[in-house]
């Protein structure tokens, strides 16, 4: 007599790409179209993700792995597995509820995504501003004012000249 509880789980023999149910004729069956199972012994297959609208397909669904999405041009991924697409802005802007807005004075954004960040405060490191910041670029900090005092050289000595016909080793 075959009993309902077996010592070995029959589902353990079902590979990825199948589902298992010992109440059916065929204990292991292939996942139906547009579904997948990424591990063996699964009781059901998962519905494939569909990349629609602002999402586009980066990798098609297979019987053993889900589809992967990215975003259409003008948008970028947010969240684990690109769960959301967010509108791109220009460099020097950030996305607000009202759309893309220029960075306020004293802040910058050098990417098409994310928020405007404050310029680096060079004086906190005892340095001076070498290149001013813009909406798109952070300031460039230079040597501290003390490094530029008389008698202190801020010029790097030139590298020794090479003999002609020799290449660096």
């Amino acid at each position: 007599f075959e009993r309902t509880r077996s010592l070995q789980d029959p589902c353990s023999n079902c590979p990825a790409g199948t589902f298992c149910d010992n109440n059916r004729n065929q204990i292991c069956s292939p996942c139906p179209p547009n579904s997948f199972s990424s591990a063996g012994g699964q009781r059901t297959c998962d519905i494939c993700r569909q990349c629609k609208g602002v999402f586009r397909t980066r990798k098609e669904c297979s019987s053993t792995s889900n589809a992967e999405c990215d975003c259409t041009p003008g948008f970028h991924c947010l969240g684990a597995g690109c769960s959301m697409c967010e509108q791109d802005c220009k460099q020097g802007q950030e996305l607000t509820k009202k759309g893309c807005k220029d960075c306020c004075f004293g802040t910058f954004n050098d990417q098409k995504r994310g928020i405007c960040r404050p310029w680096t405060n060079c004086s906190l490191d005892g340095k001076s501003v070498l290149v001013n910041g813009t909406k798109e670029r952070d300031v460039v900090c230079g040597p501290s004012p003390a490094d530029l005092s008389p008698g202190a050289s801020s010029v790097t000595p030139p590298a020794p000249a090479r003999e002609p016909g020799h290449s660096p080793q």
Epitope: F19, D21, N25, I47
Partner: antibody, heavy 122, light 106 residues
């Protein structure tokens, strides 16, 4: 459409045997396992087990102690249930049911026979 | 075995909303089905996979829940809904049914 048609009611005495049948139509019989369900008068449904209609292998619940046999007449798309050494507590309606699992949800009984009443009385 | 517990009886008036509960002694994931049985008839599938409406079943019926607590809702109830409602789990062996909830329409 899919139909499961069961044999008619049976009146038996204790100690006798009964064999009831369930004829399937409207689908490929050997594609789906056939399950049997018991319903004593005024009581809940109780799963008895299943028969694999492709291999003929039966599976019984633990408390069916050898008096119950599931069998097939696959050429006639028919599943059968035989109960031997009948007891009063076997008085019940017996249903056959086609089990379905589409892969993305768990299984269910999609189709049922109309039921066969077996009365055991001396 | 997984025991499914249902309240034995409910009485409601036509047009009202009714909920039938089913509690499991251990998790059955979403492998929970609901059947309607009228006197002298075989059970009829209403809901499969806890929340999916079987084809041909009126949208007045809906199911919810996962794990150990499940609900069948009928809104609005009609006179024709007088029947016994059974839940069934297909997650654990052996498959089990609830004891049934008899719905009476006042």
């Amino acid at each position: 459409q899919i139909q499961l048609v069961q044999s008619g009611p049976e009146l038996k005495k204790p100690g006798e045997s009964v064999k009831i049948s369930c004829k399937a139509s409207g689908y490929t019989f050997t594609d789906y396992a056939m399950h049997w369900v018991k319903q004593a008068p005024g009581k809940a449904l109780k799963w008895m087990g299943l028969i694999n209609t492709y291999t003929g292998k039966p599976t019984y619940v633990d408390d069916l102690k050898g008096r119950f046999v599931f069998s097939l007449e696959a050429s006639a798309s028919t599943a059968k249930l035989q109960i031997s050494n009948l007891k009063n507590e076997d008085t019940a309606i017996y249903f056959c049911a086609r089990y379905y699992h589409d892969g993305t949800y768990y299984g269910w009984f999609a189709n049922w026979g109309q039921g066969t009443l077996v009365t055991v009385s001396s | 075995d997984t025991v499914l517990t249902q309240s034995p009886a409910l009485a409601v008036s036509p047009g009202e909303r009714v909920t039938v509960s089913c509690g499991a002694t251990e998790s059955v994931s979403t492998a929970l089905n609901w059947y309607q049985q009228k006197p002298g008839q075989q059970p009829r599938l209403l809901i499969y996979g806890a929340s999916n409406l079987e084809s041909g079943v009126p949208a007045r019926f809906s199911g919810s829940g996962s794990g150990t607590d499940f609900t069948l809702s009928i809104d609005p109830v009609e006179a024709d809904d007088t029947a016994t409602y059974f839940c069934q789990q297909t997650w654990n062996d052996p498959l089990t049914f609830g004891s049934g909830t008899k719905l009476e329409i006042k």
